[in-house]
Interface confidence: medium
């Protein structure tokens, strides 16, 4: 029996999207490339629920993890890789005293219970995001059952 699985193998499903948590490390720009290579985007966070989910994944694995947010275009103006600005309500996710731009820290990472700005050339883990498959057409992915990845409760 073939079961519909909305995400590729080793990706995690959450609220209509698929997420890939890397097991290797790259700098921020190379992380963008790595996500593009698999038809995805370095993660752009759109809601508090999504943030809580991703923060939990990162903190559970105790990893510093790139997200698709930087102020490379203009110092102090944080922008997602899809061009959207950082929403006011998202400022609360910065860790205490961050972003501090110490030594040209222009790229954002998951760090502990919140966000930190760090040097973009540092190698870190990364998270890719893409829309989940609807599994309603022949070309969608039909895979054998994947390991269950239940949605965790909000942080």
């Amino acid at each position: 029996e073939r079961l519909c699985h909305p995400c590729p193998w080793e990706w995690t499903f959450f609220q209509g999207n698929c997420y890939f948590m890397s097991n290797s490390q790259r700098n921020w720009h190379d992380s963008i490339t790595a996500c593009k290579e698999v038809g995805a985007q370095l993660v752009v966070i759109k809601s508090a629920e999504e943030q809580n989910f991703l923060q939990l994944q990162s903190s559970r694995s105790n990893r510093f993890t790139w997200m698709g947010l930087s102020d490379l275009n203009q110092e102090g103006t944080w922008q997602w890789v899809d061009g959207s600005p950082l929403l006011p309500s998202f400022k609360q996710y910065w860790n205490r005293g961050e972003p501090n731009n110490v030594g040209e820290e222009d790229c954002a990472e998951f760090s502990g219970n919140g966000w930190n700005d760090d040097k973009c050339n540092l190698a870190k883990f990364w998270i890719c995001k893409k829309s989940a498959a609807s599994c309603s057409r022949d070309e969608e992915q039909f895979l054998s059952p994947a390991p269950a990845t239940p949605n965790p409760p909000p942080a």
Epitope: A48, P88, S89, K91, Q92
Partner: antibody, heavy 122, light 106 residues
Framework: QVTLRESGPALVKPTQTLTLTCTFS??????????VSWIRQPPGKALEWLAL???????YYSTSLKTRLTISKDTSKNQVVLTMTNMDPVDTATYYC??????????????WGRGTLVTVSS | DIQLTQSPSTLSASVGDRVTITCRAS??????LAWYQQKPGKAPKLLIY???SLESGVPSRFTGSGSGTEFTLTISSLQPDDFATYYC????????FGQGTKVEIK
């Protein structure tokens, strides 16, 4: 010790502009994550958020009052100023300033001033 | 704008009672909710942030819970100092307060 203190006129006339000053100590509005807000409370009624200014000078206003409000800061003086134009008797309220702390637990108000009562009357 | 609705508006209780106040949001606010206590003529005082985290110095009889659109503030054993008005506040999208719940002596 962290303190906030509101100051301004106790009485303003209808159509006039209200200017309120929040003077604070024990923290700096140049520290990442720190914000100062203005909140008001008409007598016997609920709290109403008015405006907020961030450490990086981003400003946010209540949707219903944004055309009448301006918030600004003077980091060197440890002050935040709110101006509210075209005052009306319904704007009679106690006006509070409050701090938003730095950190990843959100932008709530952890410390408040005592408030200043502003009456709008001719 | 996100609206917060508190219930009940007024609550009559006695010392030692367990008291529960509910706050409902018009849309999901995750756990970005705070609770404040206000006494007549005084500024509000922060009790709970991020739905369930107790502010430093606040007695442990105050507990917050909930996520999404429904939240509660519970006082496990009401003390004389707890008779006051309580407000919830969301900070998921800008900032809004509930209309308040007055806890009065029965």
């Amino acid at each position: 010790q962290v303190t906030l203190r509101e100051s301004g006129p106790a009485l303003v006339k209808p159509t006039q502009t209200l200017t309120l000053t929040c003077t604070f100590s024990g923290f700096s509005l140049s520290t990442s994550g720190i914000s100062v807000s203005w909140i008001r409370q008409p007598p016997g009624k609920a709290l109403e958020w008015l405006a907020l200014i961030d450490w990086d000078d981003d400003k946010y206003y209540s949707t219903s009052l944004k055309t009448r409000l301006t918030i600004s800061k003077d980091t060197s003086k440890n002050q935040v100023v709110l101006t509210m134009t075209n005052m009306d008797p319904v704007d009679t309220a106690t006006y509070y300033c409050a701090r938003t702390p730095s950190g990843s637990y959100g932008r709530y108000f952890d410390l408040w001033g005592r408030g200043t009562l502003v009456t709008v009357s001719s | 704008d996100i609206q917060l609705t508190q219930s009940p508006s007024t609550l009559s209780a006695s010392v030692g009672d367990r008291v529960t106040i509910t706050c409902r949001a018009s849309q999901s606010i995750s756990n970005w909710l705070a609770w404040y206590q206000q006494k007549p003529g005084k500024a509000p005082k922060l009790l709970i942030y991020k739905a369930s985290s107790l502010e430093s110095g606040v007695p442990s009889r105050f507990t917050g819970s909930g996520s999404g659109t429904e939240f509660t503030l519970t006082i496990s054993s009401l003390q004389p100092d707890d008779f006051a008005t309580y407000y919830c506040q969301q900070y998921n999208s800008y900032w809004t307060f509930g209309q308040g719940t007055k806890v009065e002596i029965k």
